[in-house]
């Protein structure tokens, strides 16, 4: 094939090589950019900046090499449009620094920076950490800082991400209240800070105030939905990013729902309880306190991380006729109490009950102070019992 006379020539099925001396001063309008997986650039002294717009449309790019060129600056967001980038070789350029943000969000298997006049500062603490942790092939490069010695020997005691303290109200917060949060940011070289409020939705009206180093946030007219929702303060400096999340507990009274008993491998009387603080629960059977045992007990489902409501079952392992009756769930917290009742009929007497025998009880009197996986089975017979439809 005839030699390619252009600044950039195809290389393989999805590669591009740009090696003609001084032919490029930016990466705009590269031919076939949208399908490129590999881009090799060499001897481009006029290519001094790499910015967000330069790599727009290179969404498939996996390997980027810019070597022996004049690159002095790579923007923190330069690789925003190349999320699949896994190998980045920027050796033998004029880079003095490279922001931690530049590589954030990428899964780089290889990062080559040798041959650059790096300037040791806290802004390269992230790279020093890569070297310490053996990431991206960095240790093998034995990176040097221009006139300062090895990167590995750079003092880093003062190179920390910002320190955040979020102040939340001590007092109880009620539905309808306004809540003021304050985020105090400390640290060197603070660049940006803010709040992440994506979980809040309709939980409150939000008003931001202030700026570095003290950010204010007012949550007005809060609802009970604010419970378990993260309010996050973040801050960045040249070393990295810090985040602190807090939750505001909004008090509200206990509520409870009971549903019709359902038969699974065992029987379940489904319930839902809500309230902040979390309510204490107590079951009554036919009006008397039910003592929980391995045959009848409260079983909670895994709670959702972002809500206060708890779902569960009063689980009954192979109940009999003595368990037929009225079940009441009492829920109480300092802001109120609630109850719900349901009748459950599990089966008729399977033991040929003699009317002259005393009727057994399976509950404790109200003033009692008692604290309180089935085997894999082959069924020998059709179980007794009546099916109860889910309500």
């Amino acid at each position: 094939a005839a030699p390619c006379p252009d600044a950039c020539c195809p290389h393989g099925s999805s590669g591009l090589r740009c090696t003609r001396d001084g032919a490029l001063d930016s990466l705009h309008h590269l031919p076939g950019a949208e399908n490129l997986t590999e881009l090799y650039i060499e001897n481009q002294q006029h290519l001094q900046h790499l910015e967000l717009r330069d790599l727009r449309g290179l969404g498939e790019l996996r390997n980027l090499t810019i070597v022996k060129s004049g690159l002095r600056f790579v923007a923190p967001d330069a690789f925003h449009f190349t999320p699949r980038l896994s190998r980045l070789n920027l050796s033998f350029n004029a880079l003095e620094s490279l922001s931690w943000k530049t590589v954030q969000g990428l899964s780089l298997q290889e990062l080559v920076l040798s041959g650059n006049p790096l300037h040791c500062s806290c802004a390269l603490r992230w790279l020093q950490r890569w070297e310490e942790e053996g990431l991206g092939g960095v240790p093998e490069q034995k990176l040097q800082c221009h006139g300062q010695g090895p990167l590995a020997h750079m003092p880093n005691a003062s190179c920390g991400v910002p320190t955040l303290k979020v102040q939340v109200p001590n007092a109880s917060v009620d539905v309808g209240d306004d809540v003021l949060l304050r985020c105090q940011v400390e640290g060197r070289g603070l660049e940006q800070a803010g709040w992440i409020l994506t979980e809040l939705e309709q939980s409150a009206t939000v008003m931001k105030s202030g700026g570095l180093p003290s950010l204010g946030l007012t949550l007005a007219n809060v609802t009970s939905d604010l419970n378990r929702k993260n309010v996050t303060c973040w801050a960045e400096n040249d070393v990295g990013r810090a985040e602190v999340s807090v939750q505001v507990n909004v008090s509200f009274p206990a509520s409870v729902q009971l549903h019709t008993a359902v038969e699974m491998h065992h029987w379940c009387i489904p319930f839902s309880v809500d309230g902040q603080p979390a309510p204490s629960l107590r079951w009554l059977f036919n009006g008397s306190v039910l003592n929980e045992t391995s045959f009848i007990f409260t079983e909670f489902l895994e709670p959702a991380a972002n809500e206060t409501v708890r779902h569960g079952c009063l689980r009954l392992n192979q109940p009999t006729h003595v368990n037929n009756g009225n079940y009441t769930l009492l829920a109480a917290n300092p802001f109120g109490q609630a109850s719900a009742s349901i009748m459950a009929a599990f089966m008729d007497n399977p033991f040929e009950f003699n009317p002259e025998d005393p009727i057994p009880v399976s509950f404790s009197p109200v003033d009692t102070n008692s604290t309180s996986g089935d085997p894999v089975e082959k069924k020998d017979e059709t179980p007794f019992g009546v099916s109860v439809a889910v309500g």
Epitope: T293, Q318, P350, D357, V361, G373
Partner: antibody, heavy 115, light 108 residues
Framework: EVQLQESGPGLVKPSGTLSLTCAVS?????????WTWVRQPPGKGLEWIGE???????NYNPSLKSRVTISVDKSKNQFSLKLSSVTAADTAVYYC????????WGQGTLVTVSS | SSELTQDPAVSVALGQTVRITCQGG??????ASWYQQKPGQAPVLVIY???NRPSGIPDRFSGSSSGNTASLTITGAQAEDEADYYC???????????FGGGTKLTVL
């Protein structure tokens, strides 16, 4: 499959406290099961001591209630038995098991009360 | 009463059917479970609840209940079935568990 393993001293002095631990493996102690202790004096039958749920609920044999404490340690996936003021009548093989059906048992550990 | 009563000993000819019984007031209200125990070993669950058999237990073992009596039936007893058998159930309050005194089964 769930396995249970009792451990603790095989000899306890009269009036002392018997302490045993049951380690649960092959399953979580925080599952929807209760955990129980049963004992069997030499040449005699089985006696239920008590049961516990990972949320702290517990029930004890009324004849032993004043002397028994059963506790659970979720972080170690184990539960324990303490029996105070022991006498020679408390000499037995002590078993831990999964309640309510006692479908998995430990191999048992003999505890002798003697001076 | 919160007691379960079993016959101390029962024998059966090899291959024949044997019934081991357990009596107690609480059995009018609650199911019995049955355990087999061989010398020097921990008990093994053979029947629980409404006549359920755990995985691995031969189908010659079955359970039933009538009035205040629960029964474990072995249909076609084998030599390896020779063991002590214990019943258990909830007591009449439903809050505690109780065991029967055990039945020693001999297979002749």
């Amino acid at each position: 499959e769930v396995q249970l393993q009792e451990s603790g001293p095989g000899l306890v002095k009269p009036s002392g406290t018997l302490s045993l631990t049951c380690a649960v493996s092959g399953g979580s102690i925080s599952s929807s099961n209760w955990w129980t202790w049963v004992r069997q004096p030499p040449g005699k039958g089985l006696e239920w001591i008590g049961e516990i749920y990972h949320r702290g609920n517990r029930n004890y044999n009324p004849s032993l209630k004043s002397r028994v404490t059963i506790s659970v340690d979720k972080s170690k996936n184990q539960f324990s038995l303490k029996l105070s003021s022991v006498t020679a009548a408390d000499t037995a093989v002590y078993y831990c098991a999964r309640a309510p059906w006692f479908d998995y048992w430990g191999q048992g550990t003999l505890v002798t009360v003697s001076s | 009463s919160s007691e379960l009563t079993q016959d101390p000993a029962v024998s059966v000819a090899l291959g024949q059917t044997v019934r081991i019984t357990c009596q107690g007031g609480s059995l009018r209200s609650y199911y019995a479970s049955w355990y087999q125990q061989k010398p020097g070993q921990a008990p093994v669950l053979v029947i629980y609840g409404k006549g359920n058999r755990p995985s691995g237990i031969p189908d010659r073992f079955s359970g039933s209940s009538s009035g205040n009596t629960a029964s474990l039936t072995i249909t076609g007893a084998q030599a390896e079935d020779e063991a002590d058998y214990y019943c258990n159930s909830q007591d009449s309050s439903g809050n505690h568990l109780i065991f029967g005194g055990g039945t020693k089964l001999t297979v002749l």
